[in-house]
Amino acid sequence: FKVATPYSLYVCPEGQNVTLTCRLLGPVDKGHDVTFYKTWYRSSRGEVQTCSERRPIRNLTFQDLHLHHGGHQAANTSHDLAQRHGLESASDHHGNFSITMRNLTLLDSGLYCCLVVEIRHHHSEHRVHGAMELQVQTGKDAPSNCVVYPSSSQDSENITAA
């Protein structure tokens, strides 16, 4: 399976809300002993591998923001903790999963990563990730609403396969 990032860049005005999205592509094993762990975190474009380092999003770690379920089931994070920080991550039945960030500030600018771990109990974990940039702008040059820029189909950094 693969993870695709429909948009590689989000440019938003300060104070706006944004939903960053990843999509699970390809065949998904729905076997009894296969489960999925999905989460979000901030990172940097490291020399070794993009999305390797896991930094918190608004002080919430990837452990706090994770989703867990089998296959394409719907799920969302623990509401209380995330919503206190203006965050909510969710996934649907179609392989889409997202994180919504409310009331953006300049400090929210940076690289965001979604991580999917396919857990095959008794065998191994397969991890795939997607990366996208968020730019929060202020002042007269800032857009009135979020502007999104599609990922190029050749951008291997935004689609990784197990």
């Epitope: 070794v48 896991r54 990837f62 452990q63 771990v117 109990h121």
Partner: antibody, heavy 117, light 107 residues
């Protein structure tokens, strides 16, 4: 802050079953892998197995025939049973939280179990 | 199962010196390797995940490197509290395995 605490008898007779419980406090047990790891005196660490929040288990093949790990989410506890113990099973037993695609990030303080008649 | 071999078994150094610990895997583990520190009577503590990323709260003097089968944990300048046993651990597949450990002792 999630904390783990092992409990159970410190002395078990040969051929009997070792039973330990790990209590998870300060967080939810309904996610992650919940693992048992042991360390014989003066030796290294050995992963025994885990139970996933969904109930799926995975055991070290070297111990699989003797190990059972179970979970009681209502009590925020998971348990280890190791049957037919011998002196070679004498060790400090740790419970730990293992994050998928990450590491053992939280450990109990460990409990010493001696197998002796 | 994947066997992790750590060397040296014991490293005798003085505070302020640089410590270089090695972990070699019997087959490639990509970069799915963690390092732990264990002091006497205590549980292990996570230092490094995914070969080179420091866990939360770990001082910058600890660094990890390597991929595939050869990995290194470096302590740039040993502090008194760094004298302990260090273990590597792979998670590319199960069973999860640990190295035999390297003891860093005061010279």
């Amino acid at each position: 802050q999630v904390q783990l605490q092992e409990s159970g008898p410190g002395l078990v007779k040969p051929s009997e079953t070792l039973s330990l419980t790990c209590t998870v406090s300060g967080g939810s047990i309904s996610s992650y892998y919940w693992s048992w790891i042991r360390q014989p005196p003066g030796k290294g660490l050995e992963w025994i197995g885990y139970i996933y929040h969904s109930g799926s288990t995975n055991y070290n093949p070297s111990l699989k025939s003797r190990v059972t790990i179970s979970v009681d989410t209502s009590k925020s506890q998971f348990s280890l049973k190791l049957s037919s113990v011998t002196a070679a099973d004498t060790a400090v037993y740790y419970c730990a939280r293992d994050i998928p695609a990450f590491a053992f990030d939280i450990w109990g303080q460990g409990t010493m179990v001696i197998v002796s008649s | 199962e994947i066997v992790l071999t750590q060397s040296p078994a014991t490293l005798s150094l003085s505070p302020g010196e640089r410590a270089t610990l090695s972990c070699r895997a019997s087959q490639s583990v990509s970069y799915y390797l963690a390092w732990y520190q264990q002091k006497p009577g205590q549980a292990p503590r996570l230092l490094i995940y995914d070969a080179f990323n420091r866990a939360t709260g770990i001082p910058a003097r600890f660094s990890g490197s390597g991929s595939g089968t050869d990995f290194t944990l470096t302590i740039s300048s040993l502090e008194p509290e760094d004298f302990a046993v260090y273990y590597c651990q792979q998670r590319i597949n199960w069973p999860l395995t640990f190295g035999g450990g390297t003891k860093v002792e005061i010279k």
